[in-house]
Amino acid sequence: ARILRAPESHNVTFGSFVTLHCTATGIPVPTITWIENGNAVSSGSIQESVKDRVIDSRLQLFITKPGLYTCIATNKHGEKFSTAKAAATISIAEWSKPQKDNKGYCAQYRGEVCNAVLAKDALVFLNTSYADPEEAQELLVHTAWNELKVVSPVCRPAAEALLCNHIFQECSPGVVPTPIPICREYCLAVKELFCAKEWLVMEEKTHRGLYRSEMHLLSVPECSKLPSMHWDPTACARL
């Protein structure tokens, strides 16, 4: 067995997807296995194609830690094995997401509408793009809350939780206070499971321009734009 194309080393940021390629040839056509830090690859997807006695293997990885990845091409002539190896390193670049200067601050929730939904001591993000953030955000919830009076008993508690956690996002304190978005999965559960009918009606009304103010639109998150808990368990807030 002979390796024609060795996998290349990469220096990537945490949470990146990387595809390692390994191409080998031989008679008979070799098999390719991948080794991660000396062990069989535990995660990632492998795709293979064979053409004209050349095997091409692609290992796609979701990078959460550095590692040494080895491609091993093996074939057998009678009783003799022939093996070729090639390795690549995946290193994680210094992770420095530039700090956004979020316009706001962290404070304990002192309103009424979301009292039963938000954790008692939790810090929420108050957006200083409003003149009076607490009042403005409370009014946003209140307006949307009134519309929930007509929804089903199954939908209502889920929608209330989503609204409160979306408008009063959990706040990570620090030099730059940072709002933590809701996990996509929770948003989708409300949209597709608990409130499927209601969500459709609301989207329909939105498209037809039946909502007079943009206030209501602000109170409904776009699930697809939210981070997934599978990308990084700490990247979003769980309801």
Partner: antibody, heavy 124, light 107 residues
Framework: EVQLVESGGGLVKPGGSLRLSCAAS????????MNWVRQAPGKGLEWVSS????????YYTDSVKGRFTISRDNAKNSLYLQMNSLSAEDTAVYYC?????????????????WGQGTLVTVSS | DIQMTQSPSTLSASVGDRVTITCRAS??????LAWYQQKPGKAPKLLIY???SLESGVPSRFSGSGSGTEFTLTISSLQPDDFATYYC?????????FGQGTKVEIK
């Protein structure tokens, strides 16, 4: 390798002034908030001041408000602490400390890298 | 300001011992708490943040737990390198405050 090196400490009389500097290397200085933390001889740690990456957010502990000014020059990879109206209570080792956010980008990680400190002595 | 109180102030232990240090906050800080280790003449070193998240490169014998007002730092099996002073720090709200420190000394 991340390095923070403080300088500018020394002996100063009560009422006097001093400017501390912290030279940063080994990381993208302009992407990080920076802090000053002090420790009086034989005592515990006390947070003094913080400044965000673009200087939009600045905070001080009550005892230094109006006397100390934190600033930074991202082009020079430097953090500063201008200390005026010094008193004996300000005698301490002053540490420059970096902070960061964890990999998610949301959760704050305080004081993950520290300098070796510079001693400020206020005495007549 | 939020007051942080550590106990005990001094702790005598032997290599291999399980050591627990407690930190109490005067009001709830949810999980916004960090732990540091400091050796004489050296700068502090971050061990734990967000009450229980282990900082990269810190040995797994260190662990943090707790939420609200009561927190603990545990060293599962004390090593010679662990004799030092430990500080907790809240970063729930400014002013950020530290505990007074716990000195872990050789018995």
């Amino acid at each position: 390798e991340v390095q923070l090196v403080e300088s500018g400490g020394g002996l100063v009389k009560p009422g006097g002034s001093l400017r501390l500097s912290c030279a940063a290397s080994g990381f993208t200085f302009s992407s990080y908030s920076m802090n000053w933390v002090r420790q009086a001889p034989g005592k515990g740690l006390e947070w003094v001041s913080s400044i965000s990456s673009s200087s939009s957010y600045i905070y001080y502990t009550d005892s230094v408000k109006g006397r100390f000014t934190i600033s930074r020059d991202n082009a020079k990879n430097s953090l500063y602490l201008q200390m005026n109206s010094l008193s004996a209570e300000d005698t301490a080792v002053y540490y420059c400390a970096r902070d960061r956010y964890d990999r998610s980008g949301y959760y704050y990680v305080p004081f993950d890298q520290w300098g070796q400190g510079t001693l400020v002595t206020v005495s007549s | 300001d939020i007051q942080m109180t550590q106990s005990p102030s001094t702790l005598s232990a032997s290599v291999g011992d399980r050591v627990t240090i407690t930190c109490r906050a005067s009001q709830s800080i949810t999980s916004w708490l960090a732990w540091y280790q400091q050796k004489p003449g050296k700068a502090p070193k971050l061990l734990i943040y967000k009450a229980s998240s282990l900082e990269s490169g810190v040995p797994s014998r260190f662990s943090g737990s707790g939420s609200g007002t009561e927190f603990t730092l545990t060293i599962s099996s004390l090593q010679p390198d662990d004799f030092a002073t430990y500080y907790c720090q809240q970063y729930n709200s400014f002013s950020w405050t530290f505990g007074q420190g716990t000195k872990v000394e050789i018995k």
